[in-house]
Interface confidence: medium
């Protein structure tokens, strides 16, 4: 039988009546066009909905938009279009929502062709009121908030000017011209690239990287011959053209661009690219594209300096620049990432790492599944996960994998069971241990979401027909109940729940179609009465993360420590609640050689945990640039893996070697930098 349909499934009592009392319909007095939804703040219940409708006339396109606001998690909406003077809002800019709980919102309006500048509507009270502001420029990008101060905004203009506001968009100042890309760094710092000879495209590879730490009063050039730059964790990366040819290399800085080091990564040619897949304050996952139009490359993981890289995964699927990769951070368990590789036979397979890229393996075959037609051996196969690439290929995959930091261990994804990803209709699988083991959760493709920190999982079947049924589970996907939320089926367009998975409300969006009109409609269901009591201590159980052999003393040790969590028992039907905090208990592990990566000039032979000196570098000057200066690099051949907290145990000691280096790439060195003031 399908999961959840056997006798062992306990029923949630009287759920139909409980849910019916907590189902709220809102029909939008609107022609169907496009709809976008934004949550304003955390735990505020405020949702803004922007509907837009385009009527193509003979000479021009006439646009109309409406703005709605809810302050009860979507149960009721009020039309507040009059607060923005019934202005047409440009959907490509979306709704720019301020960081944290600032309550700030910026909407960018469509203006007539001959106007001097654009127009924005600003709110700093969770969209209760808006102020209209005319801009001295036409915006090219959405307004970007400084992460440290929501009053500071930056935007690029259609004429490549960099504009900054210090009073939440009331007054704007152009701080620099000829700007290609601008990003906020930490401490209200702005990094941006500039061109000298005409355009961003023409000067690609000859751009300059600038920094201002005082919102445009003074500037410092921190790099030249720049192709592009990126920020990840505490690292600033620049892709820099080589002196002699058309290749480029990654340089990295951990001091906001004052000093740079050349990353020990392969250089790339014109048709190739680098991509920061994930970054935190400890380390970086970097993808380096293979030469030629292969659609794959190599993942490298960095040391704590972002300089030394270890090869992590070969043949990593990543189509052209800005294309698709399935790389997914499993946020419900530390150290876990999932991605796809392109096999020699061009089939796509899913790989998972539990130790931040140290080792990759296939996903274990779900107990309750058979191997499909892609499997050579019907008894031996793996689970393969559908992610961005499958979605881009228009496979029947409505959603990417889902995990939430406060729903510990839970991962939900579409997948197929075989030797490779299948083009057949996928099913939905769930893991409750961060990806170590999997179970088929639902037959066929579904939309899904996590509520109440994992206490409830909600799903809706992906269908081309109108729907009126929602499924929910209170035991991490083992058993499912179905609830008919409306008599009249709707064409479903999306599930919406508050980011962070703490809410108990879910909104089902769709449209109704009649002979004359089609209208947007939302149904918001509150599950609070299903989980009628608050969880108590007895509802939780101790769970050791990354446990593969409970008797082994080192069991659960990942990156030098193990963590035990208090997790809700599957049998407990209760509310974690909005204030739920994940209870975890870390303890330090003994160090092993696996807690270390090989330093520059060293490598690990296959199936060996010891680092040995690279033969080709013995006695050679190293093309290695530390802070852009000529100096000696001392190393014992090992470096602690970033974020690894192990103590004692193995302490790899070896004679310290002087690695004499020559700096072949010093065009980012301090003496080449200059400053100027406005």
């Amino acid at each position: 039988s399908a999961p959840g349909e056997d006798e062992e499934c306990g029923r949630v009592r009287d759920f139909v009546a409980k849910l019916a009392n907590n189902t709220h319909q809102h029909v939008f007095d609107d022609l169907r066009g496009s709809v976008s939804l934004s949550w304003v703040g955390d735990s505020t219940g405020v949702i803004l909905v922007l509907t837009t409708f385009h009527v193509p006339l003979v000479i021009m396109t006439f646009g109309q938009s409406k703005l709605y606001r809810s302050e009860d998690y979507g149960k009721n909406f009020k039309d507040i279009t009059d607060l923005i003077n019934n202005t047409f809002i440009r959907t490509e800019f979306g709704m720019a929502i301020g960081p944290e709980n600032s309550g700030k919102v910026v909407l960018t309006a469509e203006v007539s062709g001959g106007s001097r500048g654009g127009r924005i509507f600003r709110s700093s009270d969770f969209a209760k009121n808006f102020v209209q502001t005319d801009l001295p420029f036409h915006p090219l990008t959405q307004m970007m908030y400084s992460p440290q101060n929501s009053d500071y905004l930056l935007a690029l203009s259609t004429e490549n000017g960099l504009w900054v506001s210090k009073n939440f968009g009331g007054k704007w100042e152009e701080i620099h011209k000829a700007v290609c890309l601008a990003k906020w760094g930490s401490d209200n710092t702005i990094f941006f690239t500039t061109y000298a000879n005409g355009s961003c495209k023409a000067d690609l590879g000859a751009l300059e990287l600038w920094r201002t730490s005082d919102l445009g009063k003074s500037f410092k050039t921190i790099g030249v011959k720049i192709y592009s730059f990126g920020l990840g964790g505490r690292f600033l990366f620049a892709s820099v053209m080589a002196d002699k040819d058309t290749t480029r290399r990654i340089h990295v800085s951990t001091d906001q661009g004052d000093t740079w080091s050349m990353a020990q990564l392969p250089s790339v040619g014109q048709e190739q690219f680098y991509s920061i897949l994930a970054a935190n304050d400890d380390m970086v996952f970097m993808h380096v594209d293979e030469p030629g139009d292969t659609g794959f490359g190599t993942i490298f993981t960095s040391d704590d300096r972002g300089i030394v890289y270890s090869k992590s995964l070969d043949r990593h699927l990543y189509t052209t620049t800005g294309g698709e990769t399935d790389f997914t951070n499993v946020t419900s368990l530390r150290g876990v990432y999932i991605t796809s590789v392109l096999s020699e036979d061009n089939s796509i397979q899913t790989m998972i790492t539990f130790d931040q890229g140290g080792r990759w393996t296939h996903l274990r075959k779900p107990e309750n599944s058979e191997c499909d037609a892609t499997a050579k051996n019907k008894n031996e196969c793996s689970l393969h996960i559908h992610a961005s690439y499958s979605i881009s290929q228009k496979l029947n995959v409505p959603m990417a994998p889902l995990s939430e930091p406060n729903a510990v261990g839970i991962v939900i994804a579409h997948g197929s069971v075989g030797d490779a990803i299948s083009v057949m209709v996928p099913d939905v699988y769930i893991s409750d241990d961060g990806g170590y083991s999997w179970t088929k959760m639902l037959e066929g493709p579904h939309y899904y979401t996590i509520l109440d920190s994992g206490g409830i999982i909600v799903a809706i079947e992906h269908s081309s027909r109108p729907i009126n049924v929602i499924k929910f589970s209170t035991d991490e996907g083992q058993c499912w109940q179905t609830y008919t939320f409306t008599r009249d089926p709707i064409y479903f367009t999306g599930l919406a729940s508050e980011p962070g998975a703490r809410s108990m409300n879910i909104s089902i969006w769709g449209f109704t179609e009649s002979f004359l009109t089609s209208q947007w409609v939302s149904y918001t269901i509150d599950f609070k009465d299903i989980l009628e009591r608050n969880c108590e201590e007895k509802d939780y159980t101790i769970w050791l993360a990354h446990s593969t052999d409970p008797e082994d003393y080192e069991d659960g040790c990942i990156l030098g420590y193990k963590e035990q969590f208090l997790r809700l028992r599957k049998s407990s039907v209760c509310q974690n609640g909005r204030d739920y905090v994940v209870t975890k208990q870390p303890s330090i592990c003994l160090c092993s050689l696996e807690d270390f990566l090989c330093d520059f000039g060293y490598y690990r032979p296959e199936n060996d945990s010891k680092c040995v000196e690279q033969p080709e570098l013995k006695g050679h000057d190293l093309e290695f640039c530390l802070y852009g200066r000529e100096e000696h690099l001392t190393t014992n051949g090992y470096r602690k893996i970033p974020g690894d907290k192990c103590q004692g145990g193995v302490n790899p000691v070896r004679e310290v070697k002087d690695l004499k280096k020559k700096c072949t790439s010093n065009f980012l060195s301090p003496e080449k930098q200059n400053s100027k003031s406005n």
Partner: antibody, heavy 118, light 107 residues
Framework: EVQLVESGGGLVQPGGSLRLSCAAS????????MSWVRQAPDKRLEWVAI????????YYSDTVKGRFTISRDNSKNSLYLQMNSLRAEDTAVYYC???????????WGQGTLVTVSS | DIQMTQSPSSVSASVGDRVTITCHAS??????IGWLQQKPGKAFKGLIY???NLKDGVPSRFSGSGSGADFTLTISSLQPEDFADYFC?????????FGQGTKVEKR
């Protein structure tokens, strides 16, 4: 029945050496980390050293580092503590203790007395 | 090193009394604390692990509470076999460290 039995204690002069043993039975010895803990005459407990289940990784308290060596022989279900350069302050009852991944001192032996005196 | 300060060093009590022993860690240790019992001539016995979890076979009159830096062992109704020495131990970080011990004796 899960059991740990220490042996090898005795009287030794300062600067001397001693080797303690701990025989384990009633559980799969090779899957547990093992520790030595000592109790001074004033009843204070001090953790001395730990060894991982496979024997690859060891860790020592600063007071014994460089003088004591913990080791194990999983084929014999035995844990050892080689004590060199003994000092008067090493006088104590020495206990071996089992560590699982969930709980670090869940089974103890009866202890063996080591007296360092001239 | 993390210091574990245990108090009181001794407590006089009668059968049926509620006894409370506390341990303070010099820095946060999450719930990485265990409580041990020592009786003369007997091996140490583990009572509580991870601050609050009762080891299998230990009577429910023993309970642990606290997290972070302050922890408590409570014997809700003292029984004759409970007169013994009690120690806390932290295992959040190497080196593992013990409290000075609390002697529970007959009043």
């Amino acid at each position: 029945e899960v059991q740990l039995v220490e042996s090898g204690g005795g009287l030794v002069q300062p600067g001397g050496s001693l080797r303690l043993s701990c025989a384990a039975s009633g559980f799969t010895f090779s899957t547990y980390g093992m520790s030595w803990v000592r109790q001074a005459p004033d009843k204070r407990l001090e953790w001395v050293a730990i060894i991982s289940s496979g024997g690859s990784y060891t860790y020592y308290s600063d007071t014994v580092k460089g003088r004591f060596t913990i080791s194990r022989d999983n084929s014999k279900n035995s844990l050892y503590l080689q004590m060199n350069s003994l000092r008067a302050e090493d006088t104590a009852v020495y206990y071996c203790s089992r560590s699982s991944s969930h709980w670090y001192f869940d089974v103890w032996g009866q202890g063996t007395l080591v007296t360092v005196s001239s | 090193d993390i210091q574990m300060t245990q108090s009181p060093s001794s407590v006089s009590a009668s059968v049926g009394d509620r006894v409370t022993i506390t341990c303070h860690a010099s820095q946060g240790i999450s719930s990485n604390i265990g409580w041990l019992q020592q009786k003369p001539g007997k091996a140490f016995k583990g009572l509580i692990y991870h601050g609050t979890n009762l080891k299998d076979g230990v009577p429910s009159r023993f309970s642990g509470s606290g997290s972070g830096a302050d922890f408590t062992l409570t014997i809700s109704s003292l029984q004759p076999e409970d007169f013994a020495d009690y120690f806390c131990v932290q295992y959040a970080q190497f080196p593992y460290t013990f409290g000075q011990g609390t002697k529970v004796e007959k009043r």
